[in-house]
Interface confidence: low
């Protein structure tokens, strides 16, 4: 028999957690699991419960997490890694749209994230999307060009800035920018 299937690991309500705010990490395997093991990678921290409740997010808790479970004498494959990010560590950047936040369908727009710090990484979030735009060509730049805008691009955007030296310590989110596609 092969290895036990990997569990899922999620952060509720989100893996982007403002400093001093609560978050719950939940490892979910099949019914009847004997033991869960939730670990913070690159550290000696682990626990033998499926749920980790963090009442107030700290810088030291940011990082990569993973979990496994045990049935009988077998360990499961590890879950996909979860990246828990502390936000609000640095001042918020500003987000603007060029040439402007109102754009015709089929046109081009560039969302620009600016910060007074020397950060080399930026993340752009659209409200309602589960993850940031992490395409490599966008991820490391302060500008996020959207070519051939469609109605699906309408919505509220925020950006974060951070350093590759501390990739899980992010700024506060920018003020929201409403992109209107006409």
């Amino acid at each position: 028999s092969g290895p036990l299937p990997k569990p899922s690991l999620q952060a509720l309500p989100s893996s982007l957690v403002p400093l001093e705010k609560p978050v719950t990490l939940r490892c979910q395997g099949p019914p009847g699991v004997d033991l869960y093991r939730l670990e913070k990678l690159s550290s000696s921290r682990y626990q033998d419960q499926a749920v980790l409740f963090i009442p107030a997010m700290k810088r030291s808790l940011a990082g990569r997490y993973r979990c496994s479970y045990q049935n009988g004498s077998l360990w499961s494959l590890p879950s996909d890694q979860l990246e828990l990010v502390a936000t609000g560590v640095f001042a918020k950047p500003s987000l603007s749209a060029q040439p402007g936040p109102a754009v015709s369908s089929g046109g081009d727009v560039t969302l620009q994230c600016q910060t007074r710090y020397g950060f080399d990484q930026f993340a752009l979030y659209k409200e309602g999307d589960p993850a940031p735009y992490k395409n490599p060509e966008r991820w490391y730049r302060a500008s996020f060009p959207i070519i051939t805008v469609t109605a699906a691009h309408s919505g509220t955007y925020r950006c974060y800035s951070f350093s590759s030296r501390d990739p899980y310590l992010w700024s506060a989110p920018s003020d929201p920018l409403e992109l209107v596609v006409t």
Partner: nanobody, 122 residues
Framework: QVQLQESGGGLVQPGGSLRLACAAS????????MGWYRQAPGKQREFVAR???????NYKDSVKGRFTISRDNAKNQVYLQMNSLKPEDTAVYYC????????????????WGQGTQVTVSS
């Protein structure tokens, strides 16, 4: 390499008690958790209890309140105190050490003792 040696098994009446011991030798510095497993005839080996280096414990639901696992880090030994034994506790009991590598997930070691027989019968 790690060697594990169990002792303390035997025949006991229902409601009785036994104390199992497991001694680890060899590369014990890499051991994180130690645990007990059991295998009844015709069944798969199952988890019973475990204890971390720091003393955190976990138990199989059916033994909670009856079995107590403890550990002596200085002696590299782990113990299983079994009270209120039931016929369904009859099995060969095995000791295992958990390793926490610097990278990769937690895993059970490939090292098992020879096991110690526990028989609960009147």
């Amino acid at each position: 390499q790690v060697q594990l040696q169990e002792s303390g098994g035997g025949l006991v009446q229902p409601g009785g008690s036994l104390r199992l011991a497991c001694a680890a030798s060899g590369s014990v510095s890499s051991i994180n958790d130690m645990g007990w497993y059991r295998q009844a005839p015709g069944k798969q080996r199952e988890f019973v209890a475990r204890i971390s280096r720091g003393g955190l414990t976990n138990y199989k639901d059916s033994v909670k309140g009856r079995f107590t696992i403890s550990r002596d880090n200085a002696k590299n030994q782990v113990y299983l105190q079994m009270n209120s034994l039931k016929p369904e506790d009859t099995a060969v009991y095995y000791c295992n050490a958990d390793f926490r590598p610097s990278s990769g997930t937690f895993r059970l070691s490939d090292y098992w003792g020879q096991g110690t027989q526990v028989t609960v019968s009147s």
